[in-house]
Each structure stands twice: as C-alpha cells, then as structure tokens.
C-alpha cells in the first residue's frame, strides 16, 4: 500500500492458480489501488464523545465494573464464495442463500494489531482467496459460514480509550500478480459482501458481538447497558468510480458487467470478448473502407461481439452518482458494423423506472464513432446499460471505450458511510440509540432509562429530581419572578408528583420576562440525527409567550435562533411531549427558556424530562441532513 501509509494485514493467496493468463499490470497506480478499497473512517469526535459519555475515567470504577469495548469487521460470505466458484467440501453452494440472518454462523480471522495501527495511522486489511476460504469455508467437513469476520476488539478498545485522531480501516483486495481483472473482480465481490464495521461498548455482564438473544438475562444489578454500532456504506453497491468518473478502454480490466458474461474458455463464442487490436487485424474482423484499413485499429484492446442471430447483449456500468447536470455517457463503437445492429442506452436509477438515454453519434477517427448521451444529475444512484441489439444472420459489434464523464462537480459524489447505533435490552430487544435515555421506557424492564442515563454529563438527561441540573438564571432582584424546581402540588397533577422546572406568571402591572439557561453542550457530530426532547405544560392563562432559543458559540460570537415558541395560551393543564430536530448545529451550544408576559397573566409554565439524544454524538447518518420536515413533533 506504499510509503508507510498503512499497515498491511495480508489475508492469504492460494499457491496454485488458474492457467496462466495475461497479467494485469503490477503497478496499478496508487489512485487505482485506492479506488479498489473500501475505507472506513470513524471520526475522532465519535471517540471523544464515546469516551466522555460512556466511559468513566478508569480510576472512578473498579476494573471489574468498567464498560468493555469490542470490534469486528464483517462481510457476507455468499458474494465472496461466488467469486471463487464451486470449491470442494463446501456444504452450501455460493449461489444458494446463506444461513438465516438470526443465526448466521461466522468464523473470525485475526484483525490488525494496535502496534501497527499506532505506527501507520491506518489499518489495511488485505483480503485474498486464501482468507476467503479460511473465513468462509474452513477445514473440510465443517459447515460453511454466512459471515467472515476480522476481530478488531483489541484495536477498537485501545482506540476508544487511549487513541488519538480518527480510526481509519481500509479493506482491499490482496495485491498479487494474477490473471487479468482479478483485483477489480475481488473489489466488486468485497463491495457486494456489504462490509461493515461493528463496535460494541457494554457494561458488565454482556460478552459478545453475537446476537444477544442466546444469552441468559443478567440480573439488573449485574448488567448495566449494551450499545452497538454498525458502520457501513449508505449505498453499499455504489461504485468507487463515482469519485473519479468511469473510463474503461478495455486495455485493463474494468468494473463493467456483461450479459452474457465476458467470453472465456467455458462460454460460447457469441458473448462479449476482449481482444487486442492485432488479433482483430489478423482475423480481418473490421473491414472498413480499403483506404482506412491500415490505420483503422485503435491501439490496445477493445470489446468484440460476434452474434449469429437476433439477440440482445448488454454492458452494465457499476453503480454511480452524479453531482453535475453535464454527466454524460460516452461510448466508442465501430461505425462500419452499425448497419447490422443498433445500440440503445438505458439509465437505471435505484428505485426508479429505467429510461432510455438519447444517444448522439459523433464520427471519430478511423471508422469509430462516439455515441454520447446526457445523463444529468439523477437524484438516486444509478447504473447505465448499453444494449446492442443485433439483427440479421451475422452481426458484429466493437466497443473501444465506455466512459461516464463530467459526473462530479466540486465535492465527491461518492457514497457516504453511515454509523448506525443501537441499544440492546436485557431480553434482546434492539432499540435505536435515540430511544435510550428519552424518558420513555422501551425495554421491558426499563433499562433504557436507567444507570447509563443518570451518569451522562450534566443537562443531558434531566428530570429535575436532583435540582436544576445545570440550568441557571442571571442575577435576580428579589422582586423578579424566578424559575424554580419544585413539584406541582395540586389534585389535578396527581399523575405528575415529581419535580419540574416551573415559572409562575402572576398578574403584574407591567410586562415581565424571565430567562433560564442550560448547561453548555458540545457540538453534535455533523449530519447526526440530533434531537432535543422535553415535556411542557402551561396551566392557566398566559398573556404573552414562551420561547426556546438555541444559542451557538460561533467563533466567539453568540448566535441565537428560536427553535420553539408558544404564545397567548389558554392552558389545558396537560403535559405535552415535544421532539425538536436540532439541525445544522455545528458549534457548542446551550438552550434558553425565555418567558414574557403582561397584564392579565395568571399561568404556571413548566418544563420537565429534558434530554439531548445520544444520537447527536454517537450516530452518523449516511447522507447529509436536508432541511425539510423540521417542524417539532408534539404529542400529549
């Protein structure tokens, strides 16, 4: 992987390979090799927040009671085994479905070492045929498994507790001299196997990344909590080429798919074949006008299709993304062959109907024509299919390059890694992390609202039972109305005997206001599904309004914006529950409750059960948040 950038964890090559074939260049450029990799980058902020929110300083708890951290990198075996073809001793074929997800068997290979990661700042796991056999097939006679895993527990545990910077893990095809296209095909199989990084941090009592359903329920005093993260591509099938465009001239293997498959010794001669131009010259395959014969051939290789009857053959691009209206398909075809067939291009967007692309031919050099078709900027990832529809007895098609050009503008339109988080209840029920510590019991025994929540930093989880939990008021004169923490002692509030943050807006001759300010919260992780939850109540008549203001500390300047507001309220005396999405918060922030009222007001304003979702700091959405549907969600 070159120049000390990473630490290679080679995962095997078989001694005997297939018969000798043309070798692909050993000097795949750095960019090309990088483009074959799947990169996992866990931001350093995640480590900081996981440490601050979940891992108490080591001295504060006994070693036995400290939370544990585990990690692994998992891949589905089926696509990897399909690549290897049928192997002796495999008890389920590569084409058949893997064992059911709930009880997926897995075999664990050794991951990288902390020492190497510390030295190289990145862990590189190279996956080859040998590792696939070892991880997915195992010794003869043993059942094949559905999941191949690399154990990264030591590494993750070190990084989360003592590491610095971000955690970079690169998974790539093992580099070795082999038959043409091997690395590209292996890279495609690795992507198809949906590689995902799994992390787990759990309090005492839980011991595995496996499904927790097959573990005994620990008693509440023994077990605290169990959080799991999965980092995976939000579009696992999206080609790395999206980042650089796709240009395939068939001189080297590319990530295109062919139907019928690319010709090899086993399949019939009327499928696509990659042939060097010299061979085509000797075979007199492309006999254009005599004057052009000598110079007609492109250098290098191209695709040839020799069909014997009416049929349809397809070349399919990898999954791509476009961020430019000028994204265009360009395909070079031999124009003297066109009368015997025609080319059709189709845009195949994910989750949408296909549509035909208007192809405009531009005559090129030496008998070749470039067909260009505008793709534009589809909303979803897409593939492009080029179909050759032959007609008549004998039909020839030759393609010299297949490119998707001008598809990115500015930042890379490549796929985004999502870090999905979950909380596992004692009985095995899995919740989204945002459901933990939100004052609603979702686990049967309520452990999603227990010990872990109460240990969060001040202000994150507040029911005012222990005072103001970080909420403060400015210096107050004795006559100014004050926010107080007390119970609503009234027959009408028997269902709510606990403490709340209250303000009495008793009748005043002039208008009054009162402000209370929260503790400061760190900046949420970019594109996290961050939310603020709280319950509120207004009892009586409010002649005025109450606002919740979010104040960001932007490079020393304070910027406030109102995120919630209620005005001139005839109180229903009902507690209402509210969820506010906190979008576009990029700096540390605090909250302010501001109440203003005038003559005739006789109301009690109350807030309770305020929480900042753990998602703000421990979850990363695959896509950047779009500002839509951001109205607060409310319920009684």
């Amino acid at each position: 992987v070159g120049s000390g950038m990473g630490t290679g964890q080679r995962a095997g090559s078989p001694a005997a390979g297939p018969p000798l074939q043309p070798r692909e260049p050993l000097s795949y450029s750095r960019l090309q090799r990088k483009s074959l990799a799947v990169d996992f980058v866990v931001p350093s902020l995640f480590r900081v927040y996981a440490r601050d929110l979940l891992l108490p300083p080591s001295s504060s708890e006994l070693k036995a009671g400290r939370p544990e951290a585990r990690g692994s990198l998992a891949l589905d075996c089926a696509p990897l085994l399909r690549l290897l073809g049928p192997a002796p001793g495999v008890s389920w074929t590569a084409g058949s479905p893997a064992p059911a997800e709930a009880r997926t068997l897995s075999r664990v290979l050794k991951g990288g070492s902390v020492r190497k990661l510390r030295r190289a700042k990145q862990l590189v796991l190279e996956l080859g045929e040998e590792a696939i056999l070892e991880g997915c097939v195992g010794p003869p006679g043993e059942a094949a498994v559905g999941l191949l895993q690399f154990n990264l527990s030591e590494l993750f545990s070190w990084w989360i507790r003592q590491g610095e910077g971000r955690l970079r893990i690169r998974l790539m095809p093992e580099k070795k001299a082999s038959e043409v296209g091997r690395e590209g095909r292996l890279s495609a199989a690795i992507r198809a196997s949906q590689p995902r990084l799994l992390f787990q941090i759990f309090g005492t009592g839980h011991s595995s990344l496996e499904s927790p359903t097959n573990m005994p329920s620990p008693s509440p005093d023994y077990f605290t909590w169990n959080l799991t993260w999965i980092m995976k591509d939000s579009f696992p099938f999206l080609s790395h080429r999206s980042r650089y465009g796709l240009e395939c001239s068939f001189d080297f293997p590319c990530e295109l798919e062919y139907s019928p498959p690319l010709h090899d010794l086993r399949n019939q001669s009327w499928s696509w074949r990659r042939i060097p131009s010299e061979e085509a010259s000797q075979m007199d395959l492309l006999d254009g006008p005599g004057a052009e014969r000598s110079k007609e051939m492109p250098r290098g290789s191209f695709l040839l299709l020799n069909t014997s009857a009416d049929s349809k053959h397809t070349i399919l691009s990898p999954w791509m993304r476009s961020s430019s209206e000028h994204c265009t398909l360009a395909v070079s075809v031999h124009r003297h062959l066109q009368p015997s067939g025609r080319y059709i291009a189709q845009l195949l967007p994910h989750n949408e109907a296909a549509r035909e692309i208007l192809l405009m031919p531009t005559p090129g050099k030496h008998g070749w024509t470039v067909l260009q078709g505008r793709i534009g900027r589809p909303d979803n990832p897409f593939r492009v299919a080029l179909e050759y529809i032959s007609s008549g007895n004998r039909s020839l098609s030759a393609v010299d390059f297949f490119a998707l050009k001008n598809c990115s503008e500015g930042t890379s339109p490549g796929s985004k890694m999502a870090l999905q988080s979950s909380f596992t209840c004692w009985n095995g029920t899995v919740l989204q992390l945002g459901q933990a510590c939100d004052f609603h019991q979702d686990c049967a025994q309520g452990e999603d609202e227990s010990q872990m929540c109460r240990k969060l930093p001040v202000g994150f989880y507040c029911n005012f039972e222990d005072g103001f939990c970080g909420w403060t008021q400015g210096t107050l004169s004795p006559h100014t109305p004050q926010w107080q923490v007390r119970t609503l002692k009234d027959a009408r509030f028997q269902d709510h005997q606990d403490h709340a943050l209250l303000l009495s807006t008793t009748d005043v001759p002039a208008s009054e206001s009162a402000t209370v300010t929260s503790a400061t919260f760190p900046a949420p992780i970019k594109s996290s599904p961050c939310e603020l939850r709280m319950s509120w109540l207004i009892r009586g008549v409010l002649r005025g309004n109450v606002s919740l203001v979010l104040v960001e500390n932007k490079t020393g300047k304070e910027q406030g914006r109102m995120v919630w507001h209620v005005a001139a309220y005839e109180g229903l005396s009902l507690w209402q529950w509210m969820v506010l999405p906190l979008l576009d918060v990029s700096d540390r922030f605090w909250l302010q409750m501001v109440a203003w009222w005038g003559q005739g007001s006789r109301a009690i304003v109350a807030f309770d059960n305020i929480s900042i979702s753990l998602d703000c700091y421990l979850t990363i959405s695959g896509e950047d948040k779009i500002l839509q549907n951001t109205a607060p969600k409310s319920r009684n």
């Epitope: 296909a354 549509r355 531009t362 505008r374 534009g376």
Partner: antibody
C-alpha cells in the same frame, strides 16, 4: 433572457430542399441540446431529432432519418435543420426547442416561435 | 413507439373552475412525462416536467400527477390566460412522443 429566434416562413416546391435556422441567445449555446419538433393538424406534435452543439453529434427519430439533417454553428450560436426531398406531407410548422436536464429529466424548456413550411407546386 | 393518448380533444370550463386534463401511455413510462402549453398564437411553454415538478415561472395553480400509464394535469382555478392547448410528452423511450393535445376553452 433565453430566446430562440427562428427563420421566416418558407414556400417551396416538391422535391426541393429547405434549411431552417434557429438562433439562440441569452445562454451558453453549447451547454444544451437543441431539439426539433414538427406540428401538423393531422399528426400533432412529432419529435424529429436533436443535436448537441458541443460535439456536433445528432440523433433522429427513425421516421425522419432520411428527411432531416441537423447541424449547429457554434460561432453564431445557430442551429439548422435541412429538410430534403420535400413533399406535401412535409408542410407543417417546425419548432426548435432548447432541452434542459432537470436532475436527469430532459424537458424542452424554451421553444422558438416556429417556422411555417408550405410545400406546393 | 409509445403512443400517448389525450382522450379529450377539447374541454369547456368556466373561470375559477378546477380543470383536469388526462393523458395515457400505451405502456408504463415511469413518471417520465412533461406537460406543455400552446397558446392560440403558436407560442409553446413548458409547464411541468417529470410528472409533477413545476417549471420556474409557472403559476402554482398548475399541478401534475400520475404514475404507470395514467397521468393528469390540473388547473385549480381557471384564469383567462389559461386558454390554450395542452400536450403531454413522454421521454421514457425513444422516440419522444406527444399526446394529441387537449384544447381548453371558456364557457
């Protein structure tokens, strides 16, 4: 603002050829495809074909492949359509239209005022 | 080729009415449909692209909907300047094809 100015009405003899022009202004000519549409009372609107002024590449409705030739002159931001071997069937109003891609959806977002062609002896 | 059919060739409505013009395709076109307005003087304008997206500058009283083979254009509150012929056009498969048009008149 975007404008497509088409040449004036034509009266031509059967068997002759005619070239219609469409001068574009108010946008970068090479950034958008130019399409041509035929309108008759009998067949309504029919798509003839398109040209990409950037590359000079053109594509045709099979029905008009032998009838129309599309070209573009980048220096004058003008698109042309030559109609050959004219018959009375070719009497129609011909529109040039700029095509824009909204996301990946092509739509003819600006139209010329149309050129009336009458084929008569 | 895909045939586009606008069954109603002409339609009379009163000012302020809600008017719906329909268009059907001979096969599924996956929302790949545009609507155009042609005024009596021959001027043509794009109204709606991709079934339901309003082209810039088009009044919000125009809306489009549909899926599969059946699509419609709705004018929610008919104004005098809406007197025109309306065409649908598919771009799912080449060649692009248009409906026969629906002429809208005032009662």
């Amino acid at each position: 603002q975007v404008q497509l100015q088409q040449s004036g009405a034509e009266l031509v003899r059967p068997g002759a050829s005619v070239t219609l022009s469409c001068k574009a202004s108010g946008y970068t000519f090479t950034d958008y495809e130019m399409h041509w549409v035929k309108q008759t009372p009998v067949h309504g609107l029919e798509w003839i074909g398109a040209i990409d002024p950037e590359t000079g590449g053109s594509a045709y409705n099979q029905k008009f492949k032998a009838k129309a030739i599309l070209t573009a002159d980048r220096s004058s931001s003008t698109a042309y359509m030559e109609l050959r071997s004219l018959t009375s069937e070719d009497s129609a109003v011909y529109y040039c239209t700029r095509t824009r891609y909204y996301g990946s959806s092509p739509a003819m977002d600006y139209w010329g005022q149309g050129t009336s062609v009458t084929v008569s002896s | 080729d895909i045939q586009m059919t606008q069954t109603t060739s002409s339609l009379s409505a009163s000012l302020g009415d809600r008017v719906t013009i329909s268009c059907s395709a001979s096969q599924g076109i996956g929302n790949y449909l545009n609507w155009y307005q042609q005024k009596p003087d021959g001027t043509v304008k794009l109204l709606i692209y991709y079934t339901s997206s309003l082209h810039s500058g088009v009044p919000s009283r125009f809306s489009g909907s549909g899926s599969g083979t059946d699509y419609s254009l709705t004018i929610s509150n008919l104004e005098p300047e809406d007197i025109a012929t309306y065409y649908c056009q598919q771009y799912s498969k080449l060649p692009y094809t248009f409906g026969g048009g629906t002429k809208l008149e005032i009662k």
